[in-house]
Every structure is written in C-alpha cells, then in structure tokens.
Amino acid sequence: NEGSVTGSCYCGKRISSDSPPSVQFMNRLRKHLRAYHRCLYYTRFQLLSWSVCGGNKDPWVQELMSCLDLKECGHAYSGIVAHQKHLLPTSPPISQASEGASSDIHTPAQMLLSTLQSTQRPTLPVGSLSSDKELTRPNETTIHTAGHSLAAGPEAGENQKQPEKNAGPTARTSAT
C-alpha cells in the first residue's frame, strides 16, 4: 500500500538519500520513535504524531531500525543532555549500585501495581541525566493502518522520568 494516504506506508515526510538527517534531527527521531514499517523501497518511522520515511539502504534508516530493535530508541531512550557531554567518562563508567531491572508496562492496573511495588531503577554514570520529560506512556497497541496509534514496546518503563530530585530513568517491575 505504498503511496496510500491511510496505509502503513504513508509518509508525512520523505528524507532523501542525498541529504541524510542532521545529528540533532536523529536525536529527535531516536527520542520520539514509536515504530517502523518496512515498505518496498523505503522504511516508514512512526513518531509521536507524525511519520518520516527513508530509503531502505540509507545508513541512518538502518541505524534507527537497529536502535528500535534493541530498544535503545523511543520509549526506552533516555538521551544525553548536550551540555553534559564532557561529563561522560571515557574510562569505564563507575556505577552506583543499581536497584534492579526494568519491565514492560502493559495495562493501567499493572502500571498502578508496579508503581506501588517499584524499588527498581537503572544506574547512570555520574553526571548523566535523562532528557526525556514524558511522564506517561500509552498501553502497548498494534499499529493501526492510519499509523497514529502508539506502541509502548519492550521495556517501555525504562525511561519513565522521575520527579526532578531523581536523576535518570526509572525502571519498574510489573507483577507476574
């Protein structure tokens, strides 16, 4: 259904292979990426409320797909604050004791349960902060053909930002 206005391969914005996205735009894509859909000649990336497409062979496209596959983009993305770049250690980062592992949040009930139960939080190197200010996440849904539903994918809880007193993302444990 490439070319269809309502299909999963409709593109709000096409990025030419001749002019790949800037570093800043790529960071924005990483942060807001929700899903991707492989089309015949290009890949469509679904963001919060819009979509962008690029050629299947373009390096930036492959990088973004890999990023989402590994859950290092989108809901799980915490990002690096630009002015803190110099604070990132070049030697192995020394971590404070982490309080645990993350878990995907599927339902409001689970979200409430996990909020009550959670003591878990990923550890960040000193000086690292999350730049993701989004506090709420939708439940995981499949991508509708109109392409506007959001997918809170694997480990969606990883970058839930805590109140400002806590630096870094929160990882929450759901009830099993």
């Epitope: 991707y36 590994l70 290092e72 960040l124 690292s128």
Partner: antibody, heavy 118, light 113 residues
Framework: EVQLVESGGGLVQPGGSLKLSCAAS????????MNWVRQASGKGLEWVAR??????????FYADSVKGRFTFSRDDSKNTAYLQMNSLKTEDTAMYYC?????????WGQGTLVTVSS | DIVMTQSPSSLAVSAGERATINCKSS????????????LAWYQQKPGQSPKLLIY???TRQSGVPDRFIGSGSGTDFTLTISSLQAEDVAIYYC?????????FGGGTKLELK
Amino acid sequence: EVQLVESGGGLVQPGGSLKLSCAASGFTFSNAVMNWVRQASGKGLEWVARIRTKPNNYATFYADSVKGRFTFSRDDSKNTAYLQMNSLKTEDTAMYYCTAWTTEGIYWGQGTLVTVSS
Amino acid sequence: DIVMTQSPSSLAVSAGERATINCKSSQSLLYSGNQKNYLAWYQQKPGQSPKLLIYWASTRQSGVPDRFIGSGSGTDFTLTISSLQAEDVAIYYCQQYYDTPWTFGGGTKLELK
C-alpha cells in the same frame, strides 16, 4: 568473525572480589547492548546484568540476586565490558558468559569460571 | 518477570526423525514497534557455551543448518529439527529478550533413541 573473550575468573573466598573482562571484536561494540549470563554446573541459564549504549547513558540493570554487589561497566574505546563482583557468595559459583545483543543476533563468549569457596 | 515454560524436559528421537520442542511465555513477546518476536533458541553441548540457533523467533543464525526451524508468535513458540542428526544431541533452551531480566526456559535434553 564475531568474538567475545571473557577473562578474570578464578577461585575466590566468600566475601572476596573479582573483576571479569569481556573483550569484543567483529561487530560494532558501541551499538551493542551487553549482558552477563551465568550458569552453575548442571543448572540452567541465569541472566545477571545488562548495560545499555552511550545514547542511553550506559544505564545498568541487575538481577536481584547480585544487586548492590556487582557493577557492570563498559569502555567503548577498548571494545571491552567489565563485571566487578564484590562480596561474593558461594552461590555465585558459576560459568559467567558475556553476551552482546545486536540486531543480527545475540553473541556469546566461551565463558570464564568463577568459583567461590573457602 | 516473564516466565518461560519449556516442554518437554527431555526428548528421545530416532535419527532422521523430527524433533519438536515447545516454549511458552507468560506474556506476549511480539513488539508492535517492529512486529518482531523477542525470542531466541540455543543449543548447548557439554562443556560448551550456548550456541545461538534462532533469533527473532524464526530467523536462523548464520551457519546454522536449515533443519533447525523456529516458529510461533506472541506467547507460543516451537523449535523443530526436521531430521535429527547425531550431532544434534544437546540441551536446547529458549530465551526471551523482550524484557529485562532476560529469562530462559528450563531446557530440553534431546537424545537419540
């Protein structure tokens, strides 16, 4: 060819420390999500720890059983991951495997044996 | 945590016959962001590290013989060895990487009948 080579294992007394290293080659290390998985003799596989990539601030995650005792770190410039293990217990005795999760699959090393005994 | 239930725990199959191992997860491993199932299958022989056979539930790792077939989606997955060879005798594990902590099935010991 993808290679993960673990080192640093050995015999240590309860309460002691060890630092495991995992040297990687054959793939883009900085893009991989690294994990440690262990296996006690004759037992199943148990996930131990995970470290994310630089864009995600090298955030780390730990199994409840090692929380507060183990520290996972990585040095992308050296293509190496590290697991600092403190306050070791007899139940930490296992083969420790370094794994690299990439979009092309999950690569495993040959493992390094950690024995905690008095 | 996601619980992975693998069955059977042991299996004896004649050479040349089909072997089927099942794995069930306590929640769906299908991510709507990319329509991929976050499930892997491993083979482990005594004294060796686990060897990746299948990832994304059905993608065969490079160099793995095509008699190893991964199938399934959501919560139910199957590893099929279409024609068992003597060198396939090993313990097989399924693993979910949809969520942290990674969790593994209890293993299936595959033997020659």
